[in-house]
């Protein structure tokens, strides 16, 4: 004959454990039912009666099957530099993440405890590492032959335009200026911006003067946002 299914509460066989969604109550020495997410144990089980569960009150929650006497308090409301990406419900805590243009400088188990504005690279510097949800932008000086004329957390350095006749040579923070004859762009016009979040970092010394010939060992080149600046400015 098949073994009878035990209903909670029941005494477990020696050496065995309670089933899924049950817990062993040390006082009653019985296997008892857990409460479902969104509930908590209002009355613990005895040898003759099972756990009595009750719904979590407003602004409290339980995310797992449990036998806690009180639900957990939801975290405080999101601050002005954050957005609520998950609301407080009876089954889940509120989650706050940083709003666009900011990154999480101090995380917590879920969401972010402290947001900080993404660094901005000043003219002459460009984004060398885009910011992410959890990391700041890194700024580096524009290499010879490139420039950034913006203060931005999303712009990288991009090549100077190539002129038939140069009126003013470009530098790290300014594009070359051509005479009235139309220039030959080494890139497509328009800026490509880095995704938010992005920020930048401390200033750096300018690179050594541009060699007389273009680097013979160019490698991977960046997506071309409008000329970013390479030092960082606080926000």
């Amino acid at each position: 004959l098949p073994a009878q299914v035990a209903f909670t509460p029941y005494a477990p066989e020696p050496g065995s454990t309670c089933r899924l969604r049950e817990y062993y109550d040390q006082t009653a020495q019985m296997c008892c039912s857990k409460c479902s997410p969104g509930q908590h144990a209002k009355v613990f089980c005895t040898k003759t009666s099972d756990t009595v569960c009750d719904s979590c009150e407003d602004s409290t929650y339980t995310q797992l099957w449990n036998w806690v006497p009180e639900c957990l308090s939801c975290g405080s409301r999101c601050s002005s530099d954050q957005v609520e990406t998950q609301a407080c419900t009876r089954e889940q805590n509120r989650i706050c993440t940083c709003r666009p243009g900011w990154y999480c400088a101090l995380s917590k188990q879920e969401g972010c405890r402290l947001c900080a504005p993404l660094r901005k690279c000043r003219p002459g510097f460009g984004v060398a590492r885009p910011g992410t949800e959890t990391s700041d932008v890194v700024c580096k000086p524009c290499a010879p032959g490139t420039f950034s004329n913006t203060t931005s957390s999303t712009d990288i350095c991009r090549p100077h335009q190539i002129c038939n006749v140069v009126a003013i040579p470009g530098n790290a923070s300014m594009d070359a200026v051509c005479t009235s004859t139309s220039p030959t762009r080494s890139m497509a016009p328009g800026a490509v911006h880095l995704p938010q979040p992005v920020s930048t970092r401390s200033q750096h010394t300018q690179p050594t003067p541009e060699p007389s010939t273009a680097p013979s060992t160019s490698f991977l080149l960046p997506m071309g946002p409008s000329p970013p600046a390479e030092g960082s400015t606080g926000d």
Epitope: P130, S135, A188, L221, M223
Partner: antibody, heavy 118, light 110 residues
Framework: QVQLVQSGAEVKKPGASVKVSCKVS????????IHWVRQAPGQGLEWIGR????????EYAPNFQDRATMTTDTSTSTAYLELSSLRSEDTAVYYC???????????WGQGTTVTVSS | EAVVTQSPATLSLSPGERATLSCRSS?????????ANWVQQKPGQAFRGLIG???DRAPGIPARFSGSGSGTDTTLTISSLQPEDFAVYYC?????????FGGGTKLEIK
């Protein structure tokens, strides 16, 4: 003149470690990331990672997260790549570079051949 | 882990012809966030960056080289092949905190 000069060829046994150096000149090493890329015989390029000499922050390709260590010594303008637990598949030419996909300052070392063989 | 696939693996063309090389991201559309790059490798020579940011030519790169991006692909086009253009071309895409190279396309003389 910008130069990246790498250390000489290495022959190592499986399980050993190798440390390749890359001495840069002609620019301030703190101004640009130093990348490490490798190319196995007859194969394509594989990005290992990059290090920011200014603060030592590193970013690694997932495949190298556990075995590669990139460091720099700004006082000597030298970058280092150490690869541990070597296996035969690590036989390749290893390049350091100032290439960065976010800049156009693109110079490469001459390459260091690392051979892993028992 | 992201995989970058280049096609074709080998492309046989004659000087003067137009070459189109493709690079595809396994994680979906190639966006500006991927900072698509193209680099050239010739035997015994240093690597040479050609295109950055999908469409920016590196300083000193001839106008016959151009880049574009659409949907899942980023493309390198060489409008009229010169003898010196026959080489291996790699694309690389940025994935949040690391670069991934494609397997390369060998452009050979037909």
């Amino acid at each position: 003149q910008v130069q990246l000069v790498q250390s000489g060829a290495e022959v190592k046994k499986p399980g050993a470690s190798v440390k390749v150096s890359c001495k840069v000149s002609g620019f301030n090493i703190k101004d640009f990331y130093i990348h490490w890329v490798r190319q196995a015989p007859g194969q394509g390029l594989e990005w290992i990672g990059r290090v920011d000499p200014e603060d030592g922050n590193t970013e690694y390709a997932p495949n190298f997260q556990d075995r590669a260590t990139m460091t720099t010594d700004t006082s000597t303008s030298t970058a280092y790549l150490e690869l541990s637990s070597l296996r035969s598949e690590d036989t390749a030419v290893y390049y350091c570079s100032t290439w960065d996909g976010f800049s156009y300052f693109d110079y490469w070392g001459q390459g260091t051949t690392v051979t892993v063989s028992s | 882990e992201a995989v970058v696939t280049q096609s074709p693996a080998t492309l046989s063309l004659s000087p003067g012809e137009r070459a189109t090389l493709s690079c595809r991201s396994s994680t979906g559309p190639v966006t500006t966030n991927n900072y698509a790059n193209w680099v050239q490798q010739k035997p015994g020579q240093a690597f040479r960056g050609l295109i950055g940011g999908t469409n920016d030519r590196a300083p000193g790169i001839p106008a016959r080289f151009s880049g574009s991006g659409s949907g899942t692909d980023t493309t390198l086009t060489i409008s009229s092949l010169q003898p010196e253009d026959f080489a291996v071309y790699y694309c690389a895409l940025w994935y949040r905190n690391h670069w991934v190279f494609g397997g390369g396309t060998k452009l050979e003389i037909k």
